[in-house]
Structure formats: C-alpha cells, structure tokens
C-alpha cells in the first residue's frame, strides 16, 4: 500500500485554483492573474475568457472558475455559454442577413429575439378566428362558427397571400 | 443528439395518397420548424412547405397547395405530411429537415434518413 | 420566380482545386444567406457552409464559402480535392424568409 501511495501522481495534490509547476518540482503553484484551474490535479491553468466587443462581464474570471460573459444591450446571447451576441430585432421582426425585417404576412414574433412564426391554424381545433393576427401577435381562436349564438360571428381573417401559401385560418 | 426519423414510404396507386411520418427527438420538437423537402430520381431538392409544430401553422409551396397537408402531434414529437391525388411525378425521396430559430433565412441543420415513395400501377 | 442556377457537372483531379458557383437571377444575392449541401448517393443532405462563409464543426477548412455581388453568385470551392469529395452540392437560399429556394445542383467528379 505504501508502495502505491509513493507511485501515485503527486501533481493529483493540487487543488483547484493551482497548478502541478513541472518546472518547480511539481510543487503546486497558484493560477497566475487572468486564468484559472476549475478542477485539481491540472499541469496548466487555463486562460480566463475577456468579455470584450458587444460581450460584457455576467461573472468576473477566478482562480477556479472562468469569467462568464453576456451581451451588451440591444444583443442577445446564442450559443452555449453565449458563444455570440445577435442582434435585437423589434417585435413583429426577425433577423436577416440585411439586419432586421418585418414578419411576412401570416407570421408573427411577439419577441425581441427569434424567428416569426405562423400564425396558429384555429380550424385545426375546430374553432374560428376570434382576433386576427399581427405581425406582433398571434391570431386569438374562439369558438366554432356552429358554437357561436345567433347574431354573434367571428371575425373573417384577411385572405391569406398567395406565394407561399399560408394555410387557412 | 438530435434526431430526425422518416417513414411511411413505399408504393403507391395514381390518384392514390399517402401519410409520411417524421419522428423527432433530441430537441424541443415545439420552437422550430420543420421543412419538408423532396427529391425526385436523378433531380434536385423540390420544397414542399413547412410547419410550426408549436401551434400547427403551415405553409405551402404553391405546386403542393391543395394537395398536401402538414400536422404534427406534439405528443408524440411526429411531424405528417399527407399528400392525395398522387400521379407518377410524385415518386421521389420525401425528406423532412429542420431549421434553426436564430435568423428568418438559415440553413437546414438536421435532415431526416428520407422515405422513398414510389407512384405506379 | 426567384431561381439559384448552378452548373450541371464539374470535374476536376485530386489535390486540385474547383469551385462551383450558384447564380441568382433576379434580386441581390446579399439579401439573404447562402447556405450549401453535400449529397452523397443514397444519402441526405448535410451542410458544408452555411450563412455564406461559415463551416459547421467537422468540415474541413479545404471548403470555403464566398458571395461575389457584382456577379449576384455565391460560390463553394474546394482546395486539396479527395476522392470522397464526390458527391452533389446544393446552394440554398430564400425568396422571403418562408420560401427556401434550391439550385439544380452540381455533380463532382474527382477524376
């Protein structure tokens, strides 16, 4: 048993927030400023991440654990860890590769980030249009014409475009 | 891993229709949307429309209005393009694929294994 | 109609370079991004550069993506050419952010 201790790597000694320093005899030194060791037993420590440009600092680099970025206002986060920054659109847009544009006829985005989306198809449910549909806003469904009360009606949705043919409402 | 399974293919009668299936996984099957895109033998890539499965929006490519029809069972994360009236320039690869929700023109990142229908007496 | 035109067929040797356009008949190919598929036969497609220059994780660097405005075309080329290159290249682009369009396609013969 003794043997196996005496075998065993004796950079596995240090902690996080240092690293196994080959060139002082594998003495366990502390991070040096600006990186980091979120695990022990490392022969390196690994170099915080600068939140610089559009990112901005969410939670500033330690010893231990590396600094963690959001995006600057106007811009939203993508990616795991928020890799990179897109852009805000309004609502009733999304993103393009010209910047943001209006949700075509039929869709809409009630976000700032996203894409726009069909409006809800009521009829898959039996129902009819109660509300119709923005660029903002989805349409709101309400009862099926045969549910309505004599007198009352749903409002008719305008027809839908042509090309692409958007399904009816 | 994300996944997309298509099925539902093989033979058909002209003037017969059919029920394709794409079963997904590995995502949240309700914030994108699914394309379905066709190939004809020896040809290119033919859309066919596409569908929000979060709340059943479709769209259609003007060729297929009328003709086909998209659902999806969120239950099931089972996107169905059915399509009637089939003649024999419908035979083709029927592939299903999936965009990304980043930006409104972006690519198809996953695409199904493709289902083979073949239109013939 | 909005229409990508690709060429039909390319050929060139290993280790050499080729480049397959993809040209777009009416509007300005800067309006929206171009994005290009590899098919391998029996396959479906996978997708070699999207958003006009980008390569998804497991690409190799030797395919790159480019837009030239004053020709209104996007290309794909390949430098360092293999014979598992072969295959068919879809472009890929939009007529409105709901209808994607797709070239013809082009078949490349690594000789």
């Known amino acids: 048993f003794e043997r196996t201790r005496s075998l065993q790597d004796p950079c596995s000694n240090c902690p996080a927030g240092t690293f196994c320093d080959n060139n002082r005899n594998q003495i366990c030194s502390p991070c040096p400023p600006n990186s980091f060791s979120s695990a022990g037993g490392q022969r390196t420590c690994d170099i915080c991440r600068q939140c610089k440009g559009v990112f901005r600092t969410r939670k500033e680099c330690s010893s231990t654990s590396n600094a963690e970025c959001d995006c600057t206002p106007g811009f939203h986060c993508l990616g795991a860890g928020c890799s990179m920054c897109e852009q805000d659109c309004k609502q009733g847009q999304e993103l393009t590769k010209k910047g943001c544009k209006d949700c075509c006829f039929g869709t809409f985005n009630d976000q700032k980030r996203g894409i726009c989306r069909p409006w809800t198809n009521c009829s898959l449910d039996g129902k009819s249009v109660l509300v119709n549909g923005t660029k903002e806003r989805d349409v709101v469904c309400g009862p099926s014409p045969a549910d309505l009360s004599p007198g009352a009606s749903s409002v008719t949705p305008p027809a839908p475009a042509r090309e692409p043919g958007h399904s009816p409402q | 891993e994300v996944q997309l399974v298509e099925s539902g293919g093989g033979l058909v009668q002209p003037g017969g229709s059919l029920r394709l299936s794409c079963a997904a996984s590995g995502y949240t099957f309700t914030s994108y949307y699914i394309y379905w895109v066709r190939q004809a033998p020896g040809k290119g890539l033919e859309w066919i429309g596409n569908?929000?499965?979060?709340?059943?929006?479709?769209f259609y490519g003007e060729k297929f209005m009328g003709r086909a029809t998209f659902s999806a069972d969120t239950s099931k994360n089972t996107a169905y393009l059915q399509m009637n009236s089939l003649r024999a320039e419908d035979t083709a690869v029927y592939y299903c694929a999936r965009r990304p929700d980043y930006s409104g023109d972006d690519y198809f990142d996953y695409w199904g294994q493709g289902t083979l229908v073949t239109v013939s007496s | 109609n909005v229409m990508l035109t690709q060429p039909h067929s390319v050929s060139e040797s290993p280790g050499k370079t080729v480049t397959i356009s993809c040209k777009l008949n009416s509007g300005n190919i800067g309006s929206y991004y171009v994005h290009w598929y590899q098919q391998r036969p029996g396959s479906s497609p996978t997708t070699m550069i999207y958003r006009d220059d980008k390569r998804p994780d497991g690409v190799p660097d030797r395919f790159s993506g480019s837009i030239d405005s004053s020709s209104n075309s996007a290309s794909l080329t390949i430098s360092g050419l293999k014979t598992e290159d072969e295959a068919d290249y879809y472009c890929h682009s939009y007529d409105s952010t709901i209808t994607p369009v797709f070239g013809g396609g082009t078949k490349l013969t690594v000789l």
């Open positions: 569908i929000w499965p979060g709340n059943g929006g479709t």
